[in-house]
Interface confidence: medium
Amino acid sequence: ASVGLPSVSLDLPRLSIQKDILTIKANTTLQITCRGQRDLDWLWPNNQSGSEQRVEVTECSDGLFCKTLTIPKVIGNDTGAYKCFYRETDLASVIYVYVQDYRSPFIASVSDQHGVVYITENKNKTVVIPCLGSISNLNVSLCARYPEKRFVPDGNRISWDSKKGFTIPSYMISYAGMVFCEAKINDESYQSIMYIVVVVGYRIYDVVLSPSHGIELSVGEKLVLNCTARTELNVGIDFNWEYPSSKHQHKKLVNRDLKTQSGSEMKKFLSTLTIDGVTRSDQGLYTCAASSGLMTKKNSTFVRVHEKPFVAFGSGMESLVEATVGERVRIPAKYLGYPPPEIKWYKNGIPLESNHTIKAGHVLTIMEVSERDTGNYTVILTNPISKEKQSHVVSLVVYVPPQIGEKSLISPVDSYQYGTTQTLTCTVYAIPPPHHIHWYWQLEEECANEPSQAVSVTNPYPCEEWRSVEDFQGGNKIEVNKNQFALIEGKNKTVSTLVIQAANVSALYKCEAVNKVGRGERVISFHVTRGPEITLQPDMQPTEQESVSLWCTADRSTFENLTWYKLGPQPLPIHVGELPTPVCKNLDTLWKLNATMFSNSTNDILIMELKNASLQDQGDYVCLAQDRKTKKRHCVVRQLTVLERVAPTITGNLENQTTSIGESIEVSCTASGNPPPQIMWFKDNETLVEDSGIVLKDGNRNLTIRRVRKEDEGLYTCQACSVLGCAKVEAFFIIEGAQEKTNLE
């Protein structure tokens, strides 16, 4: 057989035995002569380069460039390829020699008792167990253990070749610790050497680059890229890097295995690429490829190299941000720069710190924007290396949809006496101010909630046909006053008033305010009664544990059967729009109450007394009276609010202060609580007594010390006390300067 390409000037070496395969018996002599055109050498099995005592290579006596190979008493192990070749070329002639040795059909390796085969569990991979045969046509099977399994050639993926060995899909023997080949000759079994099976992994779970993205450097800085490959156990990994400036002198590559935790069923390999001083030519794509032989995974990242540190605002940076109350506002600081700048936010010149309502970072986030967040926000970017600064102002405008103040204050079902003049008010707060406030009305009986009519929370009235107040036919005579603007609680509000000249008809009135971000409405139940009147004694709003009486007064000649009820079990819905009176139509929702009747010359007075009022007593109370003649029922409703008892608290702190002799000190101590607390002042833990220089005003809230003297120095305490306890704040007043001598002295 010929190997290699024929040269122009050289013929292949010529063998004395002109066969591809030679079969000889054991113990005979093998002799082959090789002739050629230049210096020749022989290679033979089990000794690929020369010196073994049994093999003799001699120069031929009859010519130049001729060598004879002689092996006396050949054995099975001499089976294999014999190659004659020209030195320093790949021109060769080969003959394969089988030495038939029926006592030893497998060729033993030169190494000793066992071999090693490396396999992977890949379904598609085969492995060759190199049990070569000294006889070409043996019946060979493969034995694997433990447990013992035997595999025979199947004409497909399992086969034996005397020159190659036993081929089998690797997963079939991956369980085994060892394998060997076995041949049967004349009912006699012959075994090859044992081969230890080593399962080599190949699977790569992933390849991760760190940093994974956004890598920016300036010229001269060090680049360090870590490439981590996570693999199954028994895997070896080769790393390969591709990067823009491959001929980099300052490049360093370090590969190492990483320790994994005990119990981990994977291996980690790390390759670190370091470039000590990057240049602009190092900018570009860096790719790390990890290969296990059967599997390759890659990961890439882009490295940007800047000429020098810089900072600038991006083109998308906003200057005006508009938001509605309650929204989450995000103002991103859009910048270009390296390294990333330090970012500081200011509001109206004051630095912003992050807390649970605001996050001041790359993005200024206001969790639930309120109108007090309106203002100018300045973001200052500082380059940490060059200290270059850039600033940008963002104006935040917070819009408020119309809010109608009385909505939560006025009882929805209070009654109005027949014939009286009444003013209904809607006080609207909105940013921007409402572009209109409109009033509408509806007759009560057209809109009364019959028990059979379903009323939803979103649409609490079965009526929908609101009429404009200009059309007051069949209703009360109405006049809408011009909107007024008032500063209420420090806010600019729009006040719209509707004047009912004479309360003749029970009706519903609705004011609706609209601005650019929303609308608000308030429905007023205007129930006109000729019937009883309700008054509260002693106070409109009692506090818990105080006593209160509800008086229902009715003309005895007109009314009889006065009865007190409480509306229940749920209070009336106040905010979305309220159920209209008369509640007399639906007594199922009323709870009858015990009350005491008194009379004077003209009236019956039914008194319902609440001793030690509690928060549970809050709600709508109904006085029902029956017309003596017509037997028609009349209802009057009054909402009772019970104020919660609150222990005293003092808002704001007293500040320590230093004052010069002769000057004045003015401090205030604002306390809240229910019942309202009493305020007392102490100096050095003794009660402060008013005199010509010490003045206490506004229920002791404000303390003034006129023409301070040295002896006014000390610890001042403001204490607010009620039955629920005390609260106090303290401050130290230091008086500086020498005491002036008076004329008297």
Epitope: R203, D206, V207, R230, S262, G263, E265, N299
Partner: antibody, heavy 117, light 109 residues
């Protein structure tokens, strides 16, 4: 036969606890990492937790971290999931599954957990 | 955390080729596994390590993975292939976390 059988599911009120078990047979349980994976009704698969073959390493999905605990008893060939402070969104079929790294080669048939008041 | 995007549904006529994709940032750097789930049953592994097929899975099923997309291809689609298919990877950013795609419903017309 190689199999995983889950048990311990049922109806439970929000805020309460439940413990799921998974009995393994037909393979060397102590040699394999094990997962819990869940599937809400009509929804996709959501990984819950994993434990290494010897129990020394445990990892959890963010949605259950601090509430669920995965554990195993190799002597009993059993995997556990202790579920505390249950929420309505924990309602799902819970599968126990074999193999730590790479693919999940064996799944149980699942046990239904319903969190409802 | 890492996210895998799958189309909610794919339809194909019997005998045709169906392809289901699984998108993820640089998913080619990760190993992807695919599961088939039929109604009322537990999932079954159909492709692992991007393209390997467990024994018992027909050679009509194949997989590939590179760049930002992994794909499951089913040649000569049969009625019995109608099921939900899920892709899965390990998420390295949170070590040892397993991430599933949202699932794709394969309908055989």
């Amino acid at each position: 036969e190689v199999q995983l059988v889950e048990s311990g599911g049922g109806v439970v009120q929000p805020g309460r606890s439940l413990r799921l078990s998974c009995a393994a047979s037909g393979f060397t349980f102590s040699s394999y990492g094990m997962h819990w994976v869940r599937q809400a009704p009509g929804k996709g698969l959501e990984w819950v937790a994993v434990i290494s073959y010897d129990g020394s390493n445990k990892y959890y999905a963010d949605s259950v971290k601090g509430r669920f605990t995965i554990s195993r008893d190799n002597s009993k060939n059993t995997l556990y999931l202790q579920m505390n402070s249950l929420r309505a969104e924990d309602t799902a079929v819970y599968y126990c599954a074999k193999d730590w790294s790479g693919p999940i080669t064996l799944w149980g048939q699942g046990t239904l957990v319903t969190v409802s008041s | 955390s890492y996210e895998l995007m799958q189309p909610p549904s794919v339809s194909e006529a019997p005998g045709m080729t169906a392809q289901i994709t699984c998108g993820g940032n640089n998913i080619g750097s990760k190993s992807v596994h695919w599961y088939q789930q039929k109604p009322g049953q537990a999932p079954v592994l159909v492709i692992y390590y991007d393209s390997e097929r467990p024994s018992g899975i027909p050679d009509r099923f194949s997989g590939s993975n590179s760049g930002n997309t992994a794909s499951l291809t089913i040649n000569r689609v049969e009625a019995g292939d109608e099921a939900d298919y899920y892709c899965q990877v390990w998420d390295s950013s949170s070590d040892h976390h397993v991430v599933f795609g949202g699932g794709t419903k394969l309908t055989v017309l």
